[in-house]
Interface confidence: medium
Amino acid sequence: QSPTPSPTGVSSVQTPHLPTHADSQTPSAGTDTQTFSGSAANAKLNPTPGSNAISDAYLNASETTTLSPSGSAVISTTTIATTPSKPTCDEKYANITVDYLYNKETKLFTAKLNVNENVECGNNTCTNNEVHNLTECKNASVSISHNSCTAPDKTLILDVPPGVEKFQLHDCTQVEKADTTICLKWKNIETFTCDTQNITYRFQCGNMIFDNKEIKLENLEPEHEYKCDSEILYNNHKFTNASKIIKTDFGSPGEPQIIFCRSEAAHQGVITWNPPQRSFHNFTLCYIKETEKDCLNLDKNLIKYDLQNLKPYTKYVLSLHAYIIAKVQRNGSAAMCHFTTKSAPPSQVWNMTVSMTSDNSMHVKCRPPRDRNGPHERYHLEVEAGNTLVRNESHKNCDFRVKDLQYSTDYTFKAYFHNGDYPGEPFILHHSTSYNSK
């Protein structure tokens, strides 16, 4: 939404020109875009006041007419101080400047002649030093005279600029970069017949001046207001101007400060933090175990979160970042921490087999538990006859050879896994030895 860049109707209010290219000492860029890298120091962007109003001061001679006795008129000129003879109007108004005012209803221009006295304009009528009803992109010739100067008159060619509404000051800032950059560009939204070579653009943002159709300001502070004034000149005559106050977008939030994260139990963890200092909307908490990643959206007012349904004796890496939904979503840097959940009982061993290797010997095998849930790995086998424990063995692998059992006896074989902290549920099989074959 661009502001209307010109006064409506005929106006005598003058907007001061921005400093000229020569004043600004800003070299002209080869391209039509200038980029400025600034900082918060440029946050206060005030237009530089200036004026190019020219005032020509002449000392007017007073003329006295005296009648002589013969009746003939003798004109004697009394000079006050040292008065030069009248200049020609061509000389006096050689450097006349013009401002063009646009009437949006009639779509016609008024040329305001910047002179101190009310001049006459020959064929063209001019009222109060204004030439009315000029058509865009057409030349008009004005013959300027005044009783303070002599012939020849000043012939002023009015090179009328294009219509003001054909230009629009456009905010060309990329939304992704809107937190630290500003882009402004004059757009031609309708065609016109004026020579575009004669159009120059000028921007002033703070104390920076650019002679370009498009400007980019970079490295700005987020959430700061910046003011840029701009004007368009046609043959060095200003014909429209516009100002924009642009507020840079919210920046990425800072990184939260994690106070701690830890395992509270085998299936639970907790993380607490201090929020970042910059504005933000919510948090994203991600927790990664091995290659699995789960992420949660958390309310901005939270400073603690309890993680549930975690896997025992598993390393979890947590990342927490704040984000803000501005012109785009901006994510802050993620704070990281990690913990290992506490141990829990392992799951049951499986695929347990008991096979007889001889009359009084058995071979017991099983597969590891699906979930070890602890730091160590040990397999235990308990052999009972009736209610009596007859064997209790422990191996690194689930592979037990049980010898010297009694013949023709019912045995209960219990195999379980121990993870160093907890035993698992035993897998129980019953098997009997046979009568001795000999």
Epitope: G254, E255, Q257, I258, I259, F260, C261, R262, N274, V317, S333, A334, A335, M336, C337, H338, F339
Partner: antibody
């Protein structure tokens, strides 16, 4: 085993500069937040600065803000402290310390390097 | 910033006796407090964090307690290697701050 070795200390005049380095080994450097902590002769401990794994979060004690800059090079397993505009009160043993993976406390410390600021 | 005040500044204890060290915070820090031990010429060593959780490899003779603003480190049955300076540290808010230290010396 985890090792942190500081270097770069020495005698410097007030207003001068020094750059401390800390070489880390025995652990995965790029997953740990790192800190500088100092101890003036015969005095207590003072936390100086903190840097996150990707250098995106950096904090300083008010006493060094604007004068000291912490940085890290994860490819080189190194932590740095650039100290400018040094003052007599910056004289101390500077320790490089690793934050635990889960809490902002320091589980491993270097042996320290002495910085003396004197004319 | 949060100020931690340790008391006493020096504690004289006979070997075999119990030592009780105090750390008071200027505002509530929940249980976000750690204790360190420092011997002459050495770097500090983490003993306790979370006010009461012993760090890896720290013997049970070191125990921490407290929450909010009042914290205690207890060393039961002091041995010669336990005579050192002990510091508390809060990590509830930036900047991180340490107490002034308590020197535990042989009586």
């Amino acid at each position: 085993q985890v090792q942190l070795v500081e270097s770069g200390g020495g005698l410097v005049k007030p207003g001068g500069s020094l750059r401390l380095s800390c070489a880390a080994s025995g652990f995965t450097f790029n997953v740990y937040y790192m800190n500088w902590i100092r101890q003036a002769p015969g005095k207590g401990l003072e936390w100086v600065s903190y840097i996150s794994t990707s250098s995106s979060a950096i904090y300083y004690a008010d006493s060094v803000k604007g004068r000291f800059t912490i940085s890290r090079d994860n490819a080189k397993n190194s932590l740095y402290l650039q100290m400018n505009s040094l003052r007599a009160e910056d004289t101390a043993v500077y320790y490089c310390a690793r934050r635990t993976g889960s809490t902002t406390v320091f589980d491993y410390w270097g042996q320290g390097t002495l910085v003396t600021v004197s004319s | 910033e949060i100020v931690l005040t340790q008391s006493p500044a020096t504690l004289s204890v006979s070997p075999g006796e119990r030592a009780t060290l105090s750390c008071r915070a200027s505002q509530s820090i929940n249980n976000n407090l750690a204790w360190y031990q420092q011997k002459p010429g050495q770097a500090p060593r983490l003993l306790i964090y979370g006010a009461s959780t012993r760090a890896t490899g720290i013997p049970a003779k070191f125990s921490g307690s407290g929450s909010g603003t009042e914290f205690t480190l207890t060393i039961s049955s002091l041995q010669s290697e336990n005579f050192a300076v002990y510091y508390c540290q809060q990590y509830n808010k930036w900047p991180l701050t340490f107490g002034g230290g308590t020197k535990v010396e042989i009586k």
